[in-house]
Amino acid sequence: MMTGTIETTGNISAEKGGSIILQCHLSSTTAQVTQVNWEQQDQLLAICNADLGWHISPSFKDRVAPGPGLGLTLQSLTVNDTGEYFCIYHTYPDGTYTGRIFLEVLESSVAEHGARFQIP
């Protein structure tokens, strides 16, 4: 039975040209995280595999940085980066958990960030 839940940074906004951290956290389960995939719509951004380390999709390598932790840092943001991002946790023995983040990249210098949580 899947008992875990994914906490995410929710809806967030950031300034064009800036950076943002996409962060998900799996809680309420003792399942082992074997891999986390980060996807934007249907495009793979990155994979963090427990055994193999990070894989960053080559088309994003110049502006995606691994971490912190299982999170992902997007740099040099453009308005085209606006959209849905998904963290997909592969766990054993539970299976797959998916979290959703919506990022809005603003032209304005006043980008109000959504609520964030702290991961210890």
Epitope: N49, S57, H90
Partner: antibody, heavy 119, light 107 residues
Framework: EVQLVQSGAEVKKPGASVKVSCKAS????????MHWVRQAPGQGLEWIGR????????KYNEKFKTRVTMTVDTSTSTAYMELSSLRSEDTAVYYC????????????WGQGTLVTVSS | DIQMTQSPSSLSASVGDRVTITCRAS??????LAWYQQKPGKAPKLLIY???TLAEGVPSRFSGSGSGTDFTLTISSLQPEDFATYYC?????????FGGGTKVEIK
């Protein structure tokens, strides 16, 4: 056109080391991890490890961890795999292979380097 | 470690035949499976990744299916150049294990 060109065949004595090179062309070398895979005569394929040419971080198969060293020279877009304390069962064709764009599979392979370990 | 088991280990077929090769993982690997073709004295060539995505330049007669533990490579109409050994590989966990191979020979 993506190409991975490996160094020539080697004959080594047991206990020695071998260093195989893999020169990449046709793509941005630092954007793709490089893997090494070997194949003993008449046998299947066995993964040795991977190296990130950008950060030089590496991950090795536990089986080879104490004997393998992977390095890169970004100025020449060349990856190297050194295996030490060679034994007869290390006789194999060694391949470099580029990591795919969407995961840890191998989309381009070198032609292979035969390493023979014999006394 | 996850083990990959291919069957059959060899098969004989004729040009034009439909050929199916299976690969079984010892536990759930989702869709993280690749297929390679290898001809004697040559390096392997990627055919399929993520269980069903055809690699660039691979003819459409090759197809992959399956998820979880059971996977299939199908060649819809075997061509002379398809006689080779085929390997499956789990591509999301150390030590990135390969199956033992399936040799497709001419009948």
């Amino acid at each position: 056109e993506v190409q991975l060109v490996q160094s020539g065949a080697e004959v080594k004595k047991p206990g020695a080391s071998v260093k195989v090179s893999c020169k990449a062309s046709g793509y941005t070398f630092t954007n793709y991890w490089m893997h090494w895979v070997r194949q003993a005569p008449g046998q299947g394929l066995e993964w040795i490890g991977r190296i990130d040419p950008d950060s030089t971080g590496s991950k090795y198969n536990e089986k080879f961890k104490t004997r393998v060293t992977m390095t890169v020279d970004t100025s020449t877009s060349t990856a190297y795999m050194e295996l030490s304390s060679l034994r007869s069962e290390d006789t194999a064709v060694y391949y470099c292979a580029r990591e795919g764009a969407y995961g840890y599979y191998f989309d381009y392979w070198g032609q292979g380097t035969l390493v023979t370990v014999s006394s | 470690d996850i083990q990959m088991t291919q069957s059959p280990s060899s098969l004989s077929a004729s040009v034009g035949d439909r050929v199916t090769i299976t690969c079984r993982a010892s536990e759930n690997i989702y869709s993280y499976l690749a297929w390679y073709q290898q001809k004697p004295g040559k390096a392997p060539k990627l055919l399929i990744y993520n269980a069903r995505t055809l690699a660039e330049g691979v003819p459409s007669r090759f197809s992959g299916s399956g998820s979880g533990t059971d996977f299939t490579l199908t060649i819809s109409s075997l061509q002379p150049e398809d006689f080779a050994t085929y390997y499956c590989q789990y591509h999301s966990g150390s030590p990135l294990p390969f199956g033992g191979g399936t040799k497709v020979e001419i009948k």
